[in-house]
């Protein structure tokens, strides 16, 4: 569909004569008629295939035609068409003398023609007007003609319709040959896909509207490159959705079981060693001078009673020393000046003589010890406390602290390691001699059954169109993350698709 | 009075050349699509080419594409014909001819011969 | 190409009678045809053209009639001068083709 314009620039006539030769009376009040028609190989009479057009009256003998809406009529004047644009045309032009004020065809005389004349053209679509003279003995007519496509109509010949839009069909202007040109943000044949914020993950991001980025169920981030972990996953990650994998020093289905508690919690205090044994467990090696579990207590170094022969022991910073009683000397105090005859033996230790009494030995009475009996016996030092408890006198008695998994009175009963219940879904613990073992139900594994293996929703291929299938292993249930195109939670459903021309 | 006179044509070899022209006159030559007409001794009418009033289209009889070129100038009111590689086939009286019969304009020259032979 | 073909190849009629000769256009050419007059040595004279309008200076005995592929042209009382090759010629598209011509003889 488009327009044949013709602007009539200029007609001379200068004697004011029909084509008959006759004068006109008063002057020639010339109008024109045009025809515009197929292209023939040798232009001949009629119908005017392509359209016709008449002017009012435009002027006397030789007048220039303005480029406006001159006395009611249009230049230039439109010869619109609503078929493909060919290429070629055959145009009539006619000048004729208006008697009076009717210009119908049947109201003139048939000597009233002024001029004729009839062209071949070729003329392309939207070309700058094309200026053409025809002369003859008695008149010259100016003028020049185009051809422009209408609104919405584009191409070489005005047959490729394209209109503008910006709504759920698409986002587009048209360009000059009628191809769509997609607004800023859109892309696709009829610019109705948006273009998604700038590195939006091709599969687990999508968008509605140019620039965003909306993450499919799994998915997560400005860029939906980040996975979503499992539900309540405390210590762990993830690599597809859903998952749970654990960080170094943490176990079980939701990464919560602490199996690196040394690292974790620095439990142990001046500057002993800590070793794992276990979820929550651990063993302190203390270094010298300290004490506790967790090597929190300071040994004096006097309380293992160092000094021998009633010496007695003062701390130092670095260590200790003994101040020997009369008789004795050495660095415990274990050399003695004395012989039998000075009665060392206290509480009623026997002296019996050594060395040609050079020397002598106390046999001492029970509960007490020592070279000279002096000390009363420490129930600690027969290491009384099984498992590595630890031995502390308490006055007349003594008591053991033991180690995490021992019990009894010495250290003696291993506590069941399964008495926390560590086997997770139902799983049945065995004590063993260091440590335990879980025998897990169908569908669990790991070390404490924590790992589900069996139930996976995915197995069954339930996601449509190429999806990717996720398991959400608190539910057993499946998660299905669709192509671009498709919706549903099996993604079973196409994005409605537009009609071939959505106009 | 309206005259087309043509002349160039002549005995000339397969493979030559010849150049054609018609020279017009007594009407308004730039005014009129014209044509190169021949008829072949013993032969009906066959149309050669075409030329529109103002050069800008020209169409050509399949036999001769490629080979003949229609031209005009206006200036002079004078048509032409470029006859390269002839063949025998194209031996005939060779007419230039105004014709539109919107306007009843039909007018004939009385063509010029060209003979290719060897 | 639009294939013109004139029948008869000959026709022979007495003066004074009507002759009529008839032009077949391989497909339709919308009126587009011109009927001439050929004498030897002369250049063709045109009669008719649009189908049916006479060309002017041609006497009035001359006519055409005719649309879509089948035209006629008719000499309704024959004179002397008449007596020549006439062939019709299409004008609706390239290549123009001309029908092969009916030869009107003296009977």
């Known amino acids: 569909s488009g327009v044949f314009q013709l602007q009539l620039q200029e007609f001379i006539n200068e004697r004011g004569v029909l084509a008959s030769g006759r004068p006109c009376e008063p002057g020639c009040r010339t109008f024109f008629r045009v025809c515009l028609k197929h292209f023939q190989a040798v232009v001949s009479p009629g119908p005017c295939t392509f359209g016709t057009v008449s002017t009012p009256v435009l002027g006397t003998n030789s007048f220039a035609v303005r480029d406006d809406s001159s006395g009611g009529g249009r230049n230039p004047l439109q010869l619109p068409f609503n078929f493909t644009w060919p290429g070629t045309f055959s145009l009539i032009i006619e000048a004729w003398h208006a008697p009076g004020d009717d210009l119908r065809p049947e109201a003139l005389p048939p000597d009233a023609l002024i001029s004729k004349i009839a062209i071949q053209g070729s003329l392309a679509v939207g070309q700058n007007w094309l200026l053409d003279e025809q002369t003859s003995t008695l008149t010259r007519l100016r003028y020049s003609y185009r051809v422009i496509c209408s609104d919405n109509y584009y191409g070489d010949n005005c047959s490729r319709l394209c209109k503008k839009r910006n709504d759920h069909f698409g986002h587009y202007v048209c360009q000059p040959d009628g191809n769509l040109s997609c607004l800023p943000g859109w892309t696709g044949e009829y610019c109705q896909q948006p273009i998604c914020l700038s590195g939006c993950h091709e599969q687990n991001g999508y968008c509605s509207k140019p620039a965003e980025c909306l993450c499919r169920p799994g998915w997560q981030g400005r860029l939906c490159n980040e996975c979503i972990p499992h539900n309540g996953c405390r210590h762990g990650t993830c690599s597809t959705p859903w998952q749970c994998t654990c960080d170094e020093g943490w176990g079980g289905l939701f990464c919560d079981q602490d199996l690196n508690y040394c690292t974790h919690h620095s439990p142990c205090k001046n500057g002993a060693t800590c070793s794992n044994s276990g979820q929550r467990s651990y063993t302190c090696t203390c270094r010298p001078g300290y004490t506790g579990v967790d090597c929190e207590l300071e040994l004096s170094e006097c309380d293992s009673n160092p000094c021998r022969n009633g010496g007695s022991c003062k701390d130092q910073e670095d260590g200790y020393h003994c101040l020997c009683p009369p008789g004795y000397y050495g660095l415990h105090c274990e050399h003695s000046t004395l012989s039998c005859a000075d009665s060392p033996c206290f509480n009623g230790g026997s002296c019996r003589e050594r060395n040609q009494g050079a020397n002598y030995a106390c046999e001492c009475p029970p509960n007490f010890t020592g070279s000279n009996c002096e000390k009363k016996v420490d129930r600690c030092t027969s290491n009384p406390c099984a498992n590595g408890g630890q031995c502390l006198n308490r006055g007349p008695s003594r008591m053991c602290r033991c180690r995490p998994g021992f019990t009894g009175t010495y250290c003696e009963l291993h506590v069941s390691d399964c008495a926390r219940n560590p086997c997770a879904h139902g799983g049945t613990c065995h004590d063993l001699e260091n440590g335990l073992m879980c025998t897990c139900p169908a569908g669990f594994s790991g070390r404490r059954c924590e790992v589900r293996t069996s139930i996976d929703a995915c197995a069954s291929s339930p996601c449509f169109n190429r999806a990717t299938c996720y398991t959400d292993l608190s539910t057993d249930t499946f998660v299905c993350n669709c192509p671009y195109g498709f919706v549903g939670s099996r993604c079973e459903f196409p994005v409605g698709l537009p009609p071939s021309f959505p106009w | 009075e309206v005259q087309l006179v043509e002349s160039g044509g002549g005995v000339v070899q397969p493979g030559r050349s010849l150049r054609l022209s018609c020279a017009a006159s007594?009407?308004?030559?730039?005014?009129?699509?014209m044509y190169w007409i021949r008829q072949a001794p013993g032969k009906g009418l066959e149309w050669v080419a075409f030329?529109?009033?103002?050069?800008?289209?020209?169409y050509y009889r399949d036999s001769v594409k490629g080979r003949f070129t229609i031209s005009r100038d206006n200036s002079k009111s004078t048509l032409y014909l470029q006859m390269n590689s002839l063949r025998a086939e194209d031996t005939a009286v060779y007419h230039c001819?105004?014709?539109?019969?919107?306007?009843?304009?039909?007018?004939w020259g009385q063509g010029t011969m060209v003979t290719v032979s060897s | 190409e639009i294939v013109m073909t004139q029948s008869p190849a000959t026709l022979s009629v007495s003066p004074g009678e009507r002759a009529t000769l008839s032009c077949r256009a391989s497909e339709d050419i919308y009126s587009n045809l011109a009927w001439y007059q050929k004498k030897p040595g002369q250049s063709p004279r045109l009669l008719i053209y649009?189908?049916?309008r006479l060309q002017d200076g041609v006497p009035a005995r001359f006519s055409g009639s005719g649309s879509g592929t089948e035209y006629t042209l008719t000499i309704s009382s024959l004179q002397s001068e008449d007596f020549a090759v006439y062939f019709c010629?299409?004008?609706?598209?390239?290549?123009?083709?001309f029908g092969q011509g009916t030869k009107l003889e003296i009977k």
């Open positions: 007594g009407f308004t030559f730039s005014n009129y699509g």
């Open positions: 649009a189908a049916n």
């Open positions: 010629l299409q004008g609706s598209k390239f290549p123009l083709t």
């Open positions: 001819a105004a014709l539109n019969w919107e306007l009843g304009i039909d007018y």
């Open positions: 030329i529109s009033h103002g050069g800008g289209i020209t």
